[in-house]
Each structure stands twice: as structure tokens, then as C-alpha cells.
């Protein structure tokens, strides 16, 4: 079948990086600048993606593969193939419509992206708080209060968890 297909369709012989040029008796022509074909037998080459504005070139376009973009420093990718760039915030913050805002008490974010999440409620697992949480770090849970030696006291547990994604305005 492949052999008969290539006999009937000369375009199938055109490798990646070329296109089957109908204007030139179906000769395989190289993709023009700023275009590519990633598979053989194509009748046109695709236009290379341009990494413009806040998008930064991660991989340059070649005759056989499209350019790949990431985001300029200070931004991070969102969506398939980095379709959008969203600004980074600092650890201990989350991005709101009004910009980067500090995590409110009882929540933390240890990344430059995403939302503030509630501290772990150690008592739900029958444990005590070994290390207090901060805006940037979750609490560290330790042994249950019953496991502590007599006279030892645990740190006061954190405030009850709340729905993530809110922040002081």
C-alpha cells in the first residue's frame, strides 16, 4: 500500500522540513524562513510560533519543528504549550485581581504561583503542632499530645482551616 500510495502521490516522498509544491510540479521544496513541517508529505509548511511580549523563546523554530515559548523571568506559564503568562508572586503571597497579596493568617504558599492554602490541622490526625506555620510554610505536625513526655507542652494549634483562594484586600 505504501508503495502504491507513493506512486500515486509524489507528495508522500517529501520529508519533514519540506512541502509538496503544487506550483512546481509537486517538487519537494524547503520550508521558507519562519515556517516548518514536522511530518512528511505536507502540502504546506506551518508558520512558526513567535515568542513575543512576555513570552520568551525556549526553543527556536527549525524547518522540522515549531518554536517553543516559556515566559520571561517574573512570569510563569499557564495552559497547554504555555498559552498564557501570569506574573509570579513571592512565596507567602497569592495573585489576586489587585495584584500579589500576602497570605492571610492560617494559610501559606511555598511557591511563586498558585493560591494560599490552609495550614495542616494537626489535631485532625490526633497530632500536635511541632513547628508553627508561616505565610511561606505549612505547620509541622509532631507526635500526638499523649505521646509527649509528662510536663512537655505542645505549641498552640493553628486557627481552623478556611476555604483557599481568599486574601485580605
Amino acid at each position: 500500500f505504501e508503495r502504491t500510495r507513493s506512486l500515486q502521490d509524489p507528495c508522500s516522498n517529501c520529508p519533514a522540513g519540506t512541502f509538496c509544491d503544487n506550483n512546481r510540479n509537486q517538487i519537494c521544496s524547503p520550508c521558507p524562513p519562519n515556517s516548518f513541517s514536522s511530518a512528511g508529505g505536507q502540502r504546506t509548511c506551518d508558520i512558526c510560533r513567535q515568542c513575543k511580549g512576555v513570552f520568551r523563546t525556549r526553543k527556536e523554530c527549525s524547518s522540522t519543528s515549531n518554536a517553543e515559548c516559556d515566559c520571561t523571568p517574573g512570569f510563569h506559564c499557564l495552559g497547554a504549550g504555555c498559552s498564557m503568562c501570569e506574573q509570579d508572586c513571592k512565596q507567602g503571597q497569592e495573585l489576586t485581581k489587585k495584584g500579589c497579596k500576602d497570605c492571610c493568617f492560617g494559610t501559606f504558599n511555598d511557591q511563586k504561583r498558585g493560591i494560599c492554602r490552609p495550614w495542616t490541622n494537626c489535631s485532625l490526625d490526633g497530632k500536635s503542632v511541632l513547628v508553627n506555620g508561616t505565610k511561606e510554610r505549612d505547620v509541622v505536625c509532631g507526635p500526638s499530645p499523649a505521646d509527649l513526655s509528662p510536663g512537655a507542652s505542645s505549641v498552640t494549634p493553628p486557627a481552623p482551616a478556611r476555604e483557599p483562594g481568599h486574601s485580605p484586600q
Epitope: C51, K52, G53, V54, R56, T57, T72, P73, F75, Q87
Partner: antibody, heavy 117, light 107 residues
């Protein structure tokens, strides 16, 4: 064609504040970051910070975060740099530049600030 | 912060010469290296981005090369209008940083 035009500098007294303007034209204003860059006499270039009209995002070089404030007016396609508590160290040429990809593709002509009593 | 070092602060050459200006980063900047030209009147223009890509309208006598931490700008056939100061800049990591500049003069 892309054009950036700075204005607002001049002779200012120590301790005062000054607001510099960068008016952009020739492209879609909301698609590109605008940077401010400082150049002291006969010296190199220092990045102050950026304003991204697309999202209102602002980023400062830590060195300038207590000195500079960036704002913008989308309707007039202008980005502002306000410098506070001026000293002789702030005397410099201030450039705005457009950001594309990871470089500064178009620059204004610069505006000269002199801080002196 | 990434330090950008241009070891030669001034350079003297004759018209028609091939001139190279070097720039070193304090850490790998993954080819995110750009070159700017500042004319004596203060005007700044982008020449080369991403190590070796020529910005639109820049004459082909300008070229760039390098990788990792070491980069260079070459002017293959020096012309009078190339008299300027040349700055490198890294676009890999915030804050953006520039080299100290290399002033090019005619012998």
C-alpha cells in the same frame, strides 16, 4: 513605528520627588512590558523596574524598591516613574524601553535628571 | 544577581578592521544575551538578541556568538557610524543586568 518619549526631568532640589513620563506609540500598548533604566554620567546601565500594562504587573529591582514607584495611564499610553527623597546619587539619565521576549527592543531618547540645591 | 563583565572598557580600531567585544556572565545564562549600541548622542539601540540573532534593520557586519558564560560581539568591517559604546545584557534571570560597556573609538 514604535516610539517611546520620556519627559519630566530637569533640575530638582535634594529631598524632593519627581515624576518622569514615558509615552508609547506605534504598537499595542497592553501587549508589552515597559522598563525604566538608569544611567549615571559616564557609567553603565541599571534596570529599575517594569510596568506591564496588560495586567498591571509591577516588578522592581530590589535596589530601587524604596526609591522608585511605577504607575501607568492606559488611556494616554503613558508609564510613569516617580523617584522620591532625591539625592545627588539620583542624578542620571533615565530611559524607558519596551520589552520583547527577553530583550529591550526599543528605547526612548532618555531624560536627564539633575539633583542639586 | 548575575554580574555581567566587559573587561575592555575602551577599544581603539581602524576603519575596516574586524573588532570583537567580549562579555562574561557570573553564571550560565543559557544564551539569553543581548547587545546594545549607545551612540555619543545617548541614543540606545538593540543590535543582537539571544546571542546571535540580528535585530531588524541592523547591518549584517554585526554578529554575535557564545554560550554558557562567555559571549562576544563582532563587527566585521568597522565603519565610522559604529563609533559608540556597546553594552551586553542578560535576559535569563531577574534582575536584568548589564555589562559596564565597551567604548569603541577610531585610531
Amino acid at each position: 513605528q514604535v516610539q517611546l518619549q520620556e519627559s519630566g526631568a530637569g533640575l530638582v532640589k535634594p529631598g524632593a520627588s519627581v515624576k518622569l513620563s514615558c509615552k508609547a506609540s506605534g504598537y499595542t500598548f497592553t501587549e508589552y512590558i515597559i522598563h525604566w533604566v538608569k544611567q549615571r554620567s559616564g557609567q553603565g546601565l541599571e534596570w529599575i523596574g517594569w510596568f506591564y500594562p496588560g495586567s498591571g504587573s509591577i516588578k522592581y529591582n530590589e535596589k530601587f524598591k524604596d526609591k522608585a514607584t511605577l504607575t501607568a495611564d492606559k488611556s494616554s499610553r503613558t508609564v510613569y516613574l516617580e523617584l522620591s527623597r532625591l539625592t545627588s546619587e539620583d542624578s542620571a539619565v533615565y530611559f524607558c524601553a519596551r520589552h520583547d521576549n527577553q530583550y529591550f527592543d526599543y528605547w526612548g531618547q532618555g531624560t536627564t535628571l539633575t539633583v542639586s540645591s | 544577581d548575575i554580574q555581567m563583565t566587559q573587561t575592555t572598557s575602551s577599544l581603539s580600531a581602524s576603519l575596516g578592521d574586524r573588532v570583537s567585544i567580549s562579555c562574561r556572565a557570573s553564571q550560565d545564562i543559557s544564551n539569553y544575551l543581548n547587545w546594545y549600541q549607545q551612540k555619543p548622542d545617548g541614543t540606545v539601540k538593540l543590535l543582537i538578541y539571544y546571542t546571535s540573532r540580528l535585530h531588524s534593520g541592523v547591518p549584517s557586519r554585526f554578529s554575535g556568538s557564545g554560550s554558557g558564560t562567555d559571549y562576544s560581539l563582532t563587527i566585521s568591517n568597522l565603519e565610522q557610524e559604529d563609533i559608540a559604546t556597546y553594552f551586553c545584557q542578560q535576559g535569563n534571570t531577574l534582575p536584568w543586568t548589564f555589562g559596564g560597556g565597551t567604548k569603541l573609538e577610531i585610531k
